[in-house]
Amino acid sequence: ELLDPCGYISPESPVVQLHSNFTAVCVLKEKCMDYFHVNANYIVWKTNHFTIPKEQYTIINRTASSVTFTDIASLNIQLTCNILTFGQLEQNVYGITIISGLPPEKPKNLSCIVNEGKKMRCEWDGGRETHLETNFTLKSEWATHKFADCKAKRDTPTSCTVDYSTVYFVNIEVWVEAENALGKVTSDHINFDPVYKVKPNPPHNLSVINSEELSSILKLTWTNPSIKSVIILKYNIQYRTKDASTWSQIPPEDTASTRSSFTVQDLKPFTEYVFRIRCMKEDGKGYWSDWSEEASGITYEDRPSKAPSFWYKIDPSHTQGYRTVQLVWKTLPPFEANGKILDYEVTLTRWKSHLQNYTVNATKLTVNLTNDRYLATLTVRNLVGKSDAAVLTIPACDFQATHPVMDLKAFPKDNMLWVEWTTPRESVKKYILEWCVLSDKAPCITDWQQEDGTVHRTYLRGNLAESKCYLITVTPVYADGPGSPESIKAYLKQAPPSKGPTVRTKKVGKNEAVLEWDQLPVDVQNGFIRNYTIFYRTIIGNETAVNVDSSHTEYTLSSLTSDTLYMVRMAAYTDEGGKDGPEFTFTTPKFAQGEIE
């Protein structure tokens, strides 16, 4: 019998609004009051095992006590009613859980989508968190028919997929009801024809065809989604070159009605393009499909669009009446080659004499020529045709080159080595820039590039290294042959020298010493040597520093003390810093030559 509760709390299962007030009443049973010799005065209220202050209690009568909470802030409160029995022992009478939360807000932003081949799905904004189990029900009806409710699942409370098949061209009315223990609200109603909410499947079987006649076009074909029988489609077509990351788009007005093919124009020859396509209802009402799977195609080859860069070198050791000439040219970059290069054709015409033809696979040709003037032409060939010819005059042996470029300068900028010059007054056909790394250990191996005759500023398009001294030569090329070359030295990026100069004495006197040193080898300079500093000191004295111009290789220290040990070292400086050489010691004599103590 004593297992029966000693009383009860009312209300039994309260759900209250957050930040509201709430009162609970504990009513004791007579038999319990008699057994424990207690009444309502003996009631102690507790929340989550903490005693509630007496000020919140109200004794209603001998059997009932109430407790009032103001501004409930906890979501879940365990409230117990207890009595103080013999010896101040607490005896639990009854317990309840106070659940608190918020009523639902009116659902907003209700929208629906019909994914092709699937049933209509609607979603909405459920509003603030209620902290309570809140049920959302999607309601829908035609003017003449109510559809079954769509109850949102607990794990996806703000969307619901209806049970019925979509019917197009009949308006449907849709709204959402939200309900929990604290209230029920309804969204605004929306009324629409489901055809305006369609998200088509993406076009499929996208394929790409090239044209043998036109190297600038690719035709796309695809299979439209089945929804094309219900709605007129429009498309987005995007494309990019295989290695690019950004997409270009076909103007939407060109693809504004249902079709199953499209020819993309103004493409580059012999280039791989990647395409993708999506579609939607042509009036823009509804949703874009996902993008199709990508498809790629390569535009057809076109003849090379440019003549290769073309130059020559003459072997200085020539036998009488003949000279060895190496003709050299550059491979065209893909965007100018426009296809797979098959070979090169070189023609050599001795002045007003016979023609020699050569077909070459490499990018150089060595020929023995007489000392006469020659005209050389070079064309590059691919599957479609030949480039225009590059023409080069190889002057006669006694040709005197003149008219160099003027004001030649070279400087690093933006991690590139730039070269600029003032153009000669004469009409220049092209410029040849040659460069090589100056080194004491290895010969100067030349790289080169060609620039149009209108250019007077460019950068060297090779793999240049930092801290290397480049000898750059610019040769203007005229109709009758090359002009005089002009050269300049430059660094892509300077660094401090990797070794300092080694200083030695050339002559030591009682009060002066002539120091000498060698110029640093170019391999260790790492930049232009701008100046030297000589540091010298005695064992006990302060160090003295003397700056010396970089053109000097000796210097006289004066005002020295006789019969003294000096330590001297020397540093060389580029624009990026300096490096000390080894320390060297010398002793001044006690007497000058011929002097007696």
Partner: antibody
């Protein structure tokens, strides 16, 4: 020389089936889209079916959809039209045509000599 | 679908005449229009593609013009071998590809 030669036409009863073939020569067949076009006696030209060069995309006119199937065998340089549930109104000369394109149009060139299909009731 | 309407349906002309056939599309088709010639018992033959480009091997007396919805085929000086039926065809919005109903050109 680019050539298309159709075969397989003949007389067939309404509701029957027929398979037309087209042998292509003188060009790289697998590079080109192909079509069937028909012409009923004394009438104009009507496009029937299309197939892409790889065979992945096919299209049909509403009048034959669900009854005709276009296919190709690039290894054999051949185009086919499988016709079933034939109707009297399908009676026509059927032409096999190669489709070409530029950036500003798509056109049919050349045309085969045609094969006559007669459907009797 | 795009409808193609040719006019006239038939016409009589004499050798040496200048003849014009027109073709109208039910909506703009840019330059996606082609012209074919068909002689009795023969397959059609391409004359003009992309509205104005003359097919290789076709005599220069044939020319095409137009863009959008209105197109013309002109024969500058009619020759005896030109008497035939002429069809226009659009390939802009496909499928379906659609043809005009044809224009029969006969000797006067």
């Amino acid at each position: 020389e680019v050539q298309l030669v159709e075969s397989g036409g003949g007389l067939v009863q309404s509701g029957g089936s027929l398979r037309l073939s087209c042998a292509a020569s003188g060009f790289t067949f697998s590079r080109y889209e192909m079509n069937w076009v028909r012409q009923a006696p004394g009438k104009g030209l009507e496009w029937v079916a299309y197939i892409s060069n790889t065979g992945t995309t096919r299209d049909y006119s509403d009048s034959v959809k669900g009854r005709f199937t276009i296919s190709r065998d690039n290894a054999k340089n051949s185009l086919y039209l499988q016709m079933s549930s034939l109707r009297v109104e399908d009676t026509a000369v059927y032409y096999c045509v190669r489709e070409k394109f530029s950036g500003t149009s798509d056109w049919f060139d050349p045309w085969g000599q045609g094969t006559l299909v007669t459907v009797s009731s | 679908d795009i409808q193609m309407t040719q006019s006239p349906s038939s016409l009589s002309a004499s050798v040496g005449d200048r003849v014009t056939i027109t073709c109208r599309a039910s909506q703009s088709i840019s330059s996606y229009l082609n012209w074919y010639q068909q002689k009795p018992g023969k397959a059609p033959k391409l004359l003009i593609y992309a509205a104005s480009s003359l097919q290789s091997g076709v005599p220069s007396r044939f020319s095409g013009s137009g863009s959008g919805t209105d197109f013309t085929l002109t024969i500058s000086s009619l020759q005896p071998e030109d008497f035939a039926t002429y069809y226009c065809q659009q390939s802009y919005s496909t499928p379906p590809i659609t043809f005009g109903q044809g224009t029969r050109l006969e000797i006067k």
